[in-house]
Structure formats: structure tokens, C-alpha cells
């Protein structure tokens, strides 16, 4: 799988030349440039940055760089009518109000256009009522409240702490529980690491810091008004009542200073157990309502945000392949930020910029990759992955026929402890081999490989001597490529030590304090972790675009399919009586997995032996590898989620960020004991086993000898 074979090459034009050209100092400079003002989707500032990136990518040497624009539904606070939450007394007087903005960080006091904290796509409304504390607002939290504690959230305003699951799932759960409003807050237990100072003296969240974010439940639809199709000039748009994924109740985020004031008066039921307690000095009573002296006081929300169809701009750069120009390897990450984007997304965008510069340098010296590389700076990721999804909808026919791989490039860091990789099993061997060739940036691992430090710090739970690689979920721009189109995808970034840091994400995520200084002072002063991430992302793109045989190993898919089949079978076997009653069998699935394993093994043997100098046979074998991921796509999609079409992986129905294996079967089995019609419920389990077994068998057959 040599990388040294593209046309017009001299021996120096190989992976090493590409990697050696990547410089930490450039990434630092680019990050600074991208973070001096806010780049909120749909604003003039973000359009200007798009044009700057277009111009610079052209200078770097790409063959073409175009802007692709779409008119999508976005959401903004009302500038003259701010959002806030009050405690009101029995006369309706506001006796306490939450903040209207975050105190700006030092040096940024005079920056204009800092959007105040808000929950994007919240409807307008001024609900008032008693408060119920719902922990993280996960499915299991509402089960605990409703089933065990017999607490009814209907007509209540719920307050939930951020963390554990995607905020959109929290809102959906609250809606289903009958709540009339949702307050989201950051608890220090999740967003304040012990022993670290709050910003600007450290990387912890100050009391006035607030996490912004969208609260949609799009399930892969993209623009809520044009599901399935690009939001172009002649688009037919749904009415707002028919829009996909919009919340139906007002939602607003606050920091822990304000949360303290709401939670300290809570009465009603005590928390069910210690897992419901955060780190504030409050009782974490569930409610409903305030305690004795304050029982006549209520909470009132004032939400005046508006949804507006707004133009967004992707930047698409092309480096044409010399041998297979109709095969696309895509490197994409978003450009829009909530405020300054010090980590999210600009630590990723700066890395993409340096990767483009390095590829451009090689191209100027006469080199071209074997396959075409597409570079993308996506817009409106923060509003629901809109830019990437609209572009993929517009280009779906090309992508499904020509898409080899998609590598995502959002935040390069969420910590500085070790590498974190989520990818298709097809890329496991690529990632392993690449990281064995890269130097570890970690202290105490001088002269050792990245693979070694990564494996030591984040070992695989199944295979000793190997690092953990996770399933792809969603919440980022790979979603449409992987979950809808079935293009092999992966992502890599540096992460925290999950053992010692139990907070969710990084503390300053989506706050005004996510600045250049946060990264430069506290996370990566030498930009060595950024450089390592650039080497991993860039190295993957280089290999995928340049190796003669695609660096995919289908045997790794066979291994995980068996693991996932075992897991879903054991979940089902928690109901042995029902399985017997309704004749539920997993034989077809295990048989398909066995067939897949045998056929994949034979394919791999042929891959070692075939004549690589025969371009027709080479193309045939590569196409079988490229189309394997595509073979796991069910054109009908998952139940009630038509844009999640991958049968092996989907975002969890309970947490968009997490990946679930055999999601169709998993969802059919979930909480099956509570279903009113068990016969129908188990019938759906059987149908999902059938779909999964058929899909695995069909995918296996794409690897068989063609005739």
C-alpha cells in the first residue's frame, strides 16, 4: 500500500514530505486569525471569513475553490427584546432575573456582535409555572421521575443540567413528558474540574458562563424546511408548522450562578439518589415548586427569539486526482462558531488550513494525489449540520458513486491527554498503521510512537495492546456522509483523561470564553497537539487519496459485526420467555455475520494476490472496498428516521452524540416490557432482525468474486 506512486512524482513526494511540511507555528497563526471576532452562521463576518478562506486556498494552490450557498432556517435572539428567566412573586413582580449576557473576557469588552446565550430554534413564549428538576433530562431520568417517583411534569417548567447527552434529546424528552418550558444549566459537577481555576485564570467555566447550542431533533434532515433536498434558489419550503425537528416549548440556557438562585428554593421530593446531585450548595430537590416560605413564587420564562431563512456559505476546494479523478476523498470541518470559536471549530479549521497549505506546496512542486481530494469549510454546523447536509443533498448522486471517504475536522482538541478516534471499522488498520509512524507529543513518551502513548492511555476494552476506537455517532458534519450516504468516515482529535475528568465535553464549550487565549495559555501552548491532529487527519487523507489499493480492511468489519450481534442478542435474551412465545430467533443474523466473515477473509486473500499492474482489476477491487460501506445502507432508512439509513450504525435515539450498533433492533427492543401490545412489539423486533440479517448478507455478497 505504497503512497509513492502518484504521477509526476519524485521520490520526495510521499507521505513524509506532506507531513514534514505541516508546522505548529502556522496552525497557531491561523487559529489566531480565525478567532478575533465572532463568526456566527448567517452573519456578514462569517461570509467575509468564507471569502478569505476561498482566497487563501487558491493561493495555497488548489485547482479550484468555490462558494456553495444555501438559504436555510436559522435562529437568533431578538436584539431589542432579550431572553431571560424570572422568579416572580404572587403579585407577578419579578424578584430575580437571570443574566442577559456573559461578562466578556478580558480584552474582548469592546467586541460587538457577541450573540447572548440562547437555545437556537426555541419557539417564542412566556410560560410560567412550578419548577421540576429533572437531572440530565435523559430517558432514564424521566423514567425515574414518572415511574418510580410518580412526579408529573405536565404543565411544569423543567430545569435540567447539561451533559451526558445531546441537548436536543433533553428537550424532546421534556416535551414528551408534557413540560411547558425547559431551562438548561451547566452544573459545576460537569463543567468545573477540581483544582483548576475558572477562566481567565484557567480553563474552567465561571459562574456567568453559559453553553449555547441548537435544540433540534433533525435526525439527519438538514435544513428543517427542505428535508432531503438542497435549500437552493428554486427550493420549495415547508411551512414552519411542518418544519422538521423544531421544539414546541420555550428553552433557555443559564450558568451556574443563575441556576443556584433557581435551585436553592426547590422543595417537593428529595433527589432519588446521589447521582442526581451536582456540586452547587443546593438540596437538588426535584420539586415540583419551591419550598414552604417561597411556595407562592413561580418561574417565568421570557423567550423572544426568531427563526429566519438566512444565506449560508460553504467553501469547497478541489485538488484533482491524477489517476482516478472521479474518486473523492473529502476533508471537511465547519467554520461557523457560536462566538469566537477558540476550540469549536477554529482549532479544527486552522488544522484544515495547514493541511491544505501542505498539499498545495506539494502540488506546486509537480505532485498530484492519485484520487481527487475535496476540502470543505462548512457553514451552519452549529444550527444542525446544515451546510454539510445541504451540500451533500445537492451532490448526493456524485457522492454515492464517487465518494471514497470523509474525514471530519471539527475541534482538534477537547483536552490534551491522548488521541481520540471514532471511525468506520474499515479505517481501523489505516489508523493503527498511521499512528505507529507518527511521533507521540505526550510528555513521558519522547521518542515513542503516537500509537504507543495512545494505547497506553486509552486501551481497547476488547483487544490488549491496541487503542480504543469508538463508533461514529452524530452531532458533527460527517453525519450525512456516513449515516445517510454510506461513505466510509472517520474523525480524530486530542481529548481529556475520561478516567479523571468526569465533566461533559470541555468546560468552556460554546461559551464566550472559548478564545484563542484559552488554547494558547491552557490547552496547547506549543501547538504540539494540534500538529499531531493535523498529522493524523492529513495522513489519513493522504493515504486514502494516494495508496494504490484503498487502505480499508473488510475483516475488521467482520469482527465488529460479530461483537454487535452478540451484544444485541444478549439484550434480547433478557426476555427469554417472550422470545420463546413469539419465536424470536437471531439465527439469520449470526448466519449472515458468519458468511460475511468468510467472504471478507477470502476477499482479503485475493487483495494480497491480485495483479496490481492491471488497472481494470485494481479498479474493480477498489470499487468493492469503496462500495462496502454503501452496502450497509437501507434505502428505506430506520423507522421514523428516513435519513439515518445505515443498518449497522446510527446515532442513539436517546443521545445524538452516541453511536448505536444494530440501531433498528436496539430501538425495537428498548423498553419493550412497557409496550401495550407485546405481540406487535416483538413482531417489530423480528422484522428488524430480518432487515439486519439481509443487509449483512447483501453486503457480504458485494465482496464475493464478481463472476
Amino acid at each position: 500500500k505504497s503512497s509513492n506512486e502518484a504521477t509526476n512524482i519524485t521520490p520526495k513526494h510521499n507521505m513524509k514530505a506532506f507531513l514534514d511540511e505541516l508546522k505548529a507555528e502556522n496552525i497557531k497563526k491561523f487559529l489566531y486569525n480565525f478567532t478575533q471576532i465572532p463568526h456566527l452562521a448567517g452573519t456578514e463576518q462569517n461570509f467575509q471569513l468564507a471569502k478569505q478562506i476561498q482566497s487563501q486556498w487558491k493561493e495555497f494552490g488548489l485547482d479550484s475553490v468555490e462558494l456553495a450557498h444555501y438559504d436555510v432556517l436559522l435562529s437568533y435572539p431578538n436584539k431589542t427584546h432579550p431572553n431571560y428567566i424570572s422568579i416572580i412573586n404572587e403579585d407577578g413582580n419579578e424578584i430575580f432575573n437571570t443574566s442577559l449576557f456573559e461578562p466578556p473576557p478580558p480584552g474582548y469588552e469592546n467586541v460587538s456582535d457577541i450573540v447572548p446565550p440562547f437555545s437556537a430554534f426555541s419557539p417564542q413564549g412566556m410560560p410560567e409555572g412550578d419548577l421540576v428538576y429533572v437531572n440530565y433530562a435523559r430517558t432514564e431520568d424521566f423514567f425515574k421521575l414518572e415511574r418510580d417517583m410518580k412526579i408529573n411534569c405536565s404543565g411544569k417548567i423543567v430545569i435540567a443540567r447539561y451533559g451526558k447527552v445531546f441537548r436536543g434529546n433533553k428537550v424532546k424528552n421534556a416535551q414528551l413528558a408534557g413540560a411547558k418550558g425547559v431551562i438548561l444549566y451547566s452544573d459545576p459537577a460537569d463543567y468545573f474540574a477540581p483544582g483548576v481555576k475558572s477562566y481567565p485564570d484557567g480553563w474552567n467555566l465561571p459562574g456567568g458562563g453559559v453553553q449555547r447550542g441548537n435544540i433540534l431533533n433533525l435526525n439527519g434532515a438538514g435544513d428543517p424546511l427542505t428535508p432531503g433536498y438542497p435549500a437552493n434558489e428554486y427550493a420549495y419550503r415547508r411551512g414552519i408548522a411542518e418544519a422538521v425537528g423544531l421544539p414546541s416549548i420555550p428553552v433557555h440556557p443559564i450558568g451556574y450562578y443563575d441556576a443556584q438562585k433557581l435551585l436553592e428554593k426547590m422543595g417537593g421530593s428529595a433527589p432519588p439518589d446521589s447521582s442526581w446531585r451536582g456540586s452547587l450548595k443546593v438540596p437538588y430537590n426535584v420539586g415540583p415548586g419551591f419550598t414552604g416560605n417561597f411556595s407562592t413564587q413561580k418561574v417565568k420564562m421570557h423567550i423572544h427569539s426568531t427563526n429566519e431563512v438566512t444565506r449560508i456559505y460553504n467553501v469547497i476546494g478541489t485538488l484533482r486526482g491524477a489517476v482516478e479523478p472521479d474518486r473523492y476523498v473529502i476533508l471537511g470541518g465547519h467554520r461557523d462558531s457560536w462566538v469566537f470559536g477558540g476550540i469549536d471549530p477554529q482549532s479544527g479549521a486552522a488544522v484544515v488550513h495547514e493541511i491544505v497549505r501542505s498539499f498545495g506546496t506539494l502540488k506546486k512542486e509537480g505532485w498530484r494525489p492519485r484520487r481527487t481530494i475535496l476540502f470543505a469549510s462548512w457553514d451552519a454546523e452549529e444550527f444542525g449540520l446544515l451546510g454539510s447536509t445541504e451540500w451533500a443533498e445537492e451532490n448526493s448522486r456524485l457522492l454515492q458513486e464517487r465518494g471514497v471517504a470523509y474525514i471530519n475536522a471539527d475541534s482538534s482538541i477537547e483536552g490534551n491527554y491522548t488521541l481520540r478516534v471514532d471511525c468506520t471499522p474499515l479505517m481501523y488498520s489505516l489508523v493503527h498503521n498511521l499512528t505507529k509512524e507518527l511521533k507521540s507529543p505526550d510528555e513521558g513518551f519522547e521518542g515513542k510512537s503516537l500509537y504507543e502513548s495512545w494505547t497506553k492511555k486509552s486501551p481497547s476494552p476488547e483487544f490488549s495492546g491496541m487503542p480504543r476506537i469508538s463508533k461514529l455517532g452524530s452531532g458533527n458534519d460527517f453525519e450525512v456522509f456516513f449515516q445517510r450516504l454510506g461513505i466510509a468516515s472517520g474523525r480524530a482529535r486530542y481529548t481529556k483523561n475520561w478516567e479523571t475528568n468526569k465533566f461533559s465535553g470541555y468546560p468552556l464549550y460554546h461559551s464566550v470564553y472559548e478564545t484563542y487565549e484559552l488554547v494558547e495559555k491552557f490547552y496547547d501552548p506549543m501547538f504540539k497537539y494540534h500538529l499531531t491532529v493535523a498529522q493524523v487527519r492529513g495522513g489519513m487523507v493522504f493515504e486514502l487519496a494516494n495508496s494504490i489499493v484503498l487502505p480499508f480492511d473488510c475483516r475488521d468489519y467482520a469482527v465488529v459485526l460479530r461483537k454487535y450481534a452478540d451484544k444485541i442478542y444478549s439484550i434480547s435474551m433478557k426476555h427469554p420467555q417472550e422470545m420463546k412465545t413469539y419465536s424470536v430467533s437471531f439465527d439469520s443474523l449470526f448466519s449472515a455475520v458468519k458468511n460475511f466473515t468468510e467472504i471478507a477473509s477470502k476477499f482479503s486473500e485475493r487483495l494480497q494476490d491480485f495483479d496490481k499492474s492491471n488497472p481494470i482489476v485494481l479498479r474493480m477491487m477498489n470499487d468493492q472496498l469503496m462500495f462496502l460501506e454503501r452496502a450497509f445502507i437501507d434505502p428505506l432508512g430506520l423507522p421514523d428516521r428516513p435519513f439515518y439509513r445505515h443498518v449497522i450504525y446510527a446515532p442513539s435515539s436517546h443521545n445524538k452524540y452516541a453511536g448505536e450498533s444494530f440501531p433498528g433492533i436496539y430501538d425495537a427492543l428498548f423498553d419493550i416490557e412497557s409496550k401495550v401490545d407485546p405481540s406487535k412489539a416483538w413482531g417489530e423486533v423480528k422484522r428488524q432482525i430480518y432487515v439486519a440479517a439481509f443487509t449483512v448478507q447483501a453486503a457480504a455478497e458485494t465482496l464475493s468474486e464478481v463472476a
Partner: nanobody, 126 residues
């Protein structure tokens, strides 16, 4: 860790105005609320006005309501007390205080603030 320095006091006539300032330095991001207290000779220290970290909530004691206004600059570097229609009974040493505590029956009620300035004398003659 938070330093406070008051200024702007002085001798004025009844009915006049004064603007007190309190310059802050140190870890002002940890401050939850800032207050102006006053202590007249032979009397207990009393809370005059308070403002929370965000500026969304302000408190003024009944004795100064409609005459005194508390405010701060955007970067939390300076706290102000605009005092209009001053009366002889407003004569006192005015202290600036900062609290990093969140707890109290109401947001502005703190038994004891964490940080105090040295005070500035305000004298109102009739």
C-alpha cells in the same frame, strides 16, 4: 484575591449629588455580587445598594430608593454609586464590598461579604 479601592467621597450640601467609584482588581470573575454599605458614627453598618454579577438584578434600600443608583462598567473593573438629592442622614463612611458567595434568602443578602474596601467619607451638611 479581590482588591477594592473607593473614591469620590467628600463634603457636600444637602440636595447635592456625588458619584462614588470603587476600582476593582484581582479575580473579579469570581465575584457574584457587589454592594455599597455605609456606617454612620455610632450605628451599625447597613446595606445601601447591591448589583449582581450580570447587572440583571439591583437592590436599593428603601431609605435611598429613587435617589441612589448602583451601576458598573462592562468589564467589572469599576463599581459606581450615583447619589442624588443627598440628605444629612446620608452622612457616613461608604464601603464597597464584593461577595463570591451565592447563598442567601435573596440574591443580595449576604451575612458577610468576602472582600471590603477601606471606605470613603461622605458628609452632607444642612
Amino acid at each position: 484575591e479581590v482588591q477594592l479601592l473607593e473614591s469620590g467621597g467628600g463634603l457636600v450640601q444637602s440636595g447635592d449629588s456625588l458619584r462614588l467609584s470603587c476600582a476593582t482588581s484581582g479575580r473579579t470573575f469570581d465575584v457574584y455580587a457587589m454592594s455599597w454599605f455605609r456606617q454612620a458614627p455610632g450605628k451599625e453598618r447597613e446595606l445601601v445598594s447591591a448589583i449582581d454579577w450580570s447587572g440583571s438584578n439591583k437592590f436599593h434600600a428603601d431609605s435611598v430608593k429613587g435617589r441612589f443608583t448602583i451601576s458598573r462598567d462592562n468589564s467589572w473593573k469599576t463599581l459606581y454609586l450615583q447619589m442624588n438629592s443627598l440628605r444629612p442622614e446620608d452622612t457616613a463612611v461608604y464601603f464597597c464590598a464584593a461577595s463570591t458567595r451565592l447563598y442567601g434568602t435573596t440574591w443580595y443578602e449576604f451575612n458577610d461579604s468576602d472582600y471590603w474596601g477601606q471606605g470613603t467619607q461622605v458628609t452632607v451638611s444642612s
